[in-house]
Amino acid sequence: PPRGRILGGREAEAHARPYMASVQLNGAHLCGGVLVAEQWVLSAAHCLEDAADGKVQVLLGAHSLSQPEPSKRLYDVLRAVPHPDSQPDTIDHDLLLLQLSEKATLGPAVRPLPWQRVDRDVAPGTLCDVAGWGIVNHAGRRPDSLQHVLLPVLDRATCNRRTHHDGAITERLMCAESNRRDSCKGDSGGPLVCGGVLEGVVTSGSRVCGNRKKPGIYTRVASYAAWIDSVLA
């Protein structure tokens, strides 16, 4: 099943997030992703856990997953590079870089997103944008068109409370509020964008969604700048 959902959000304006990618397995949406360079998409490492021998591709320039759009194009993946420290049983280092079979054709609906290199926490309360094609309600309805939600960043101390994530949120992770509006498994790999810059990637650990005591967890890309640069080099 697809890993992800946007809960309590609404349909995004078409092609207003030209960095947005759909990581697909055998032609179906699996995870979100974000174009960070002409030939590279950043996603979550856990997304490929279920991929096995399936065909992984990346859809760029899409708003609707099913409807024809002039900007839409499906790319094969030349290689998949999960973070070397990512492990199936933890949310740590949950990053994956996918090299496209060729450089993406850039245009108004396909553009890389600048990513944060300064390793500093986003201020609590900052409103950030998350988008994805994950299910939109607890009944499991999958949207055809991209959804988005605006979420406030939550301070790490609160997120690490025993009633919340109980110390699991390291300095390389960040949290956003999850009170009815939330990202979830199905949006794994998708971007958390603050101030026009990629700050976080939706982690793909399983957790309850839309519950304020279980905030959304995002991998801080700035904390992995050296690794990203080394792979893209």
Partner: antibody, heavy 117, light 112 residues
């Protein structure tokens, strides 16, 4: 109903900067991009770029990339455009506009910028 | 970028007359996947902001009088006003949204 209210006319010296505003009402500000369009006196329309107020993402017409900076304040539902290093070529009416689907269905009333020594 | 060329640049008409103006694009605006032309028309009266008239090349915006008709496909498009009224005197712009947004230079409709 959707309304875009732009700031008053600006008179500026060559080399100076101006910052104009566009206050949106009648819809959820963070759900739509805000675009900016330039119109020189007696001339046609030129697309400058847009900001997505939700995440702050911006995209520019390459011609205007070094000239303009687009920002947005979610708390006041206001988009801003700053023009820098002004020359007489920047004298124009600047419109903010909002799309409905792919086309511009809503326009501000325009802000006239006059650059003169 | 896609270049939009409008002709004529100005047009002198009498009230009640039928007028047509042309817009040509440097590449096709027709997407075969949905058979839609990514083109809009706007009207701009003196001292006012542009107003949307037509989108998808031929779909009239709500509230726009039916004397305004958009037609054409691919690279050649036409805006027709079946019987011009004095209030139609304005500049008309075509606009493509197939790729990076560009506008034509406009056709000015004036009284003879």
């Amino acid at each position: 109903q959707v309304q875009l209210q732009q700031s008053a006319a600006e008179l500026a010296r060559p080399g100076a900067s101006v910052k104009m505003s566009c206050k949106a009402s009648g819809y959820t500000f963070t759900d739509y991009t805000m675009h900016w369009v330039k119109q020189r006196p007696g001339q046609g329309l030129e697309w400058i770029g847009y900001i997505n107020p939700s995440g702050g993402y911006t995209d520019y017409n390459q011609k205007f990339k070094d000239k303009t900076a687009l920002t947005a304040d979610k708390s006041s539902s206001t988009a801003y455009m700053q023009l820098s290093s002004l020359t007489s070529e920047d004298s124009a009416v600047y419109y903010c506009a909002r799309r409905r689907d792919y086309w511009f269905a809503y326009w501000g009333q325009g802000t006239l910028v006059t650059v003169s020594a | 970028d896609i270049v939009m060329s409008q002709s004529p640049s100005s047009l002198a008409v009498s009230v009640g007359e039928k007028v047509t103006m042309s817009c040509k694009s440097s590449q096709s605006l027709l997407y075969s996947g949905n058979q839609k032309n990514y083109l809009a028309w706007y009207q701009q009266k003196p001292g006012q902001s542009p107003k949307l008239l037509i989108y998808w090349a031929s779909t009239r915006e709500s509230g726009v009088p039916d004397r305004f008709t958009g037609s054409g496909s691919g690279t050649d498009f036409t805006l027709t006003i079946s019987s011009v009224k004095a209030e139609d005197l304005a500049v008309y712009y075509c606009h493509q949204y197939y790729s990076y947004l560009t506008f034509g230079a406009g056709t000015k409709l004036e009284l003879k």
